[in-house]
């Protein structure tokens, strides 16, 4: 007889989750020599140990510490790129400017990007049917706690000038409730981080407003300044053109200063 399973509101664990995590780990360590010492089987064991057999609404950051320890990685100073509500563009940017790193360019972020996972209390099974939804079920679920844990660590280890890409098309360009607003901002270390530079990405082609004057950006500036970190803000009016010119700044259409 099939066992009774808790029904959650969110979608279940991504199919072939263990195989996907292991394959991603192997691929990552192959092309990042500084992580070649990592044993991917140990990484998977630590990942699995964080949520397997545990009640999926009672996961803690402590559960992920063995995994975090195995995935320890440093980003060169001035090369951290945070993002909020604009993941695709941030990732497109680090693909063409490979010396900059989002969390998903790091081993642990790369392993979990776009995946869902959860287990069940007292069984060694992975739940492929449903997982807790952050809003409808609980916030201390395996996925949310993972991202909170690794985002905190990513922010804590940043140094120099830290960059953040923000979505200028949203009503709240800076949202205090986003991972950036609730976790990363508060875990930047003033003794290591000289400045936060926000890049506000415009959506409309004809949008020439200075979105750095937006009230939510002023709120971000206030939070950052109170933490003794300098704040700068820049508008990126044409994200498509921006990516093109990042790739080849010598292109004649990019030399005009735009």
């Amino acid at each position: 007889l099939p066992r009774w399973r808790q029904q959650w509101s969110g979608s279940g664990t991504t199919s072939r989750f263990p195989e996907t995590v292991l394959a991603r780990c192997v691929k990552y360590t192959e092309v990042h020599p500084e992580m070649r010492h990592v044993d991917c089987q140990s990484v998977w064991d630590a990942f699995k140990g964080a949520f397997i057999s545990k009640y999926p609404c009672n996961i803690t950051e402590e559960d992920y510490q063995p995994l975090v320890k195995l995935g320890t990685q440093t980003v060169p100073c001035n090369k951290t790129l945070l993002w909020s509500r604009i993941k695709d563009l941030a990732h497109q940017f680090t693909q063409v400017q490979r010396d900059m790193f989002t969390l998903e360019d790091m081993l642990l972020g790369y392993l979990a990007d776009d995946l869902t996972w959860c287990g069940e209390f007292n069984t060694f099974e992975i739940n492929y049917q449903s997982c807790p939804d952050w809003r409808k079920d609980c916030s201390n679920n395996p996925v949310s706690v993972f991202w909170k844990t690794v985002s905190r660590r990513f922010a804590e280890t940043a140094c120099g000038v830290v960059h953040v890409m923000l979505n200028g098309s949203r009503s709240k360009i800076f949202d205090k409730n986003s991972t950036f607003g609730s976790v990363e901002v508060h875990n930047l270390q003033p003794e290591k981080v000289q400045a936060l530079e926000a890049w506000v990405i415009h959506g409309g082609r004809e949008d020439s407003r200075d979105l750095c004057q937006d009230p939510t950006i002023k709120e971000l500036e206030s939070i950052i300044s109170k933490r003794n970190i300098r704040f700068f803000c820049k508008n990126i009016y044409r994200p498509d053109k921006f990516l093109q010119c990042v790739k080849n700044p010598e292109d004649s259409s990019c030399l005009s200063g735009i």
Partner: antibody, heavy 127, light 108 residues
Framework: EVQLLESGGGLVQPGGSLRLSCTGF????????MSWVRQAPGKGLEWVAD????????YYADSVKGRFTISRDNSANTLYVQMNSLRAEDTAVYYC????????????????????WGQGTTVTVSS | QSVLTQTPSVSGTPGQRVTISCSGI??????VSWYQQLPGTAPKLLIF???QRLSGVPDRFSGSGSGTSASLAISGLQSEDEADYYC???????????FGGGTKLTVL
Amino acid sequence: EVQLLESGGGLVQPGGSLRLSCTGFGFTFTDARMSWVRQAPGKGLEWVADISSYGDNTYYADSVKGRFTISRDNSANTLYVQMNSLRAEDTAVYYCAKRMEREVMTIKLDYHAMDVWGQGTTVTVSS
Amino acid sequence: QSVLTQTPSVSGTPGQRVTISCSGIFNIRNYVSWYQQLPGTAPKLLIFKDDQRLSGVPDRFSGSGSGTSASLAISGLQSEDEADYYCAAWDIFLNVWVFGGGTKLTVL
């Protein structure tokens, strides 16, 4: 025209010291990350040292670490390398070079290349 | 500190296409740049960021590759292309420049 002019080369005895200078023209020197690269007679290029735009970060090749010091005076648009405890194997033409950085829509990015080079100054270490 | 490996010499006749390889690039996130050094002169940047030509460099010069190897191709070879060519990469984790040993191009 963007250019770099080195000076200060010459003949020095082993164990001696020398300071090379490199002055930049035609670009905002303060914004530029700079490097020293050398070339021994008949050999290839060897990186020596690198300095950030404000001089707060310096990096050295293992072969010169502890003996050479890279520095800069942005008010004089000049880059320096102080070379102490010189050895015969330090004999080379020394080039200064500017790191390629570009502003893309006001965002300053490093392109990990040396886009402007000086003409070079010769250092001979011999007794 | 590691060195990038280049073929010591290549040759070609005018109009031909030659390729110079550079291997031993240590990280997928490092960019390769290529330099031309004409006899008795300072090096000159040709290619940056693996495959991007510096403005003013003829389109006969092209760069390719990333990850662990890169190459510089010169098509329509001309006598003035006779020079030493160097690849280089900045290691963003170790904060060091690494140069290839250089390739001497002879135009026959």
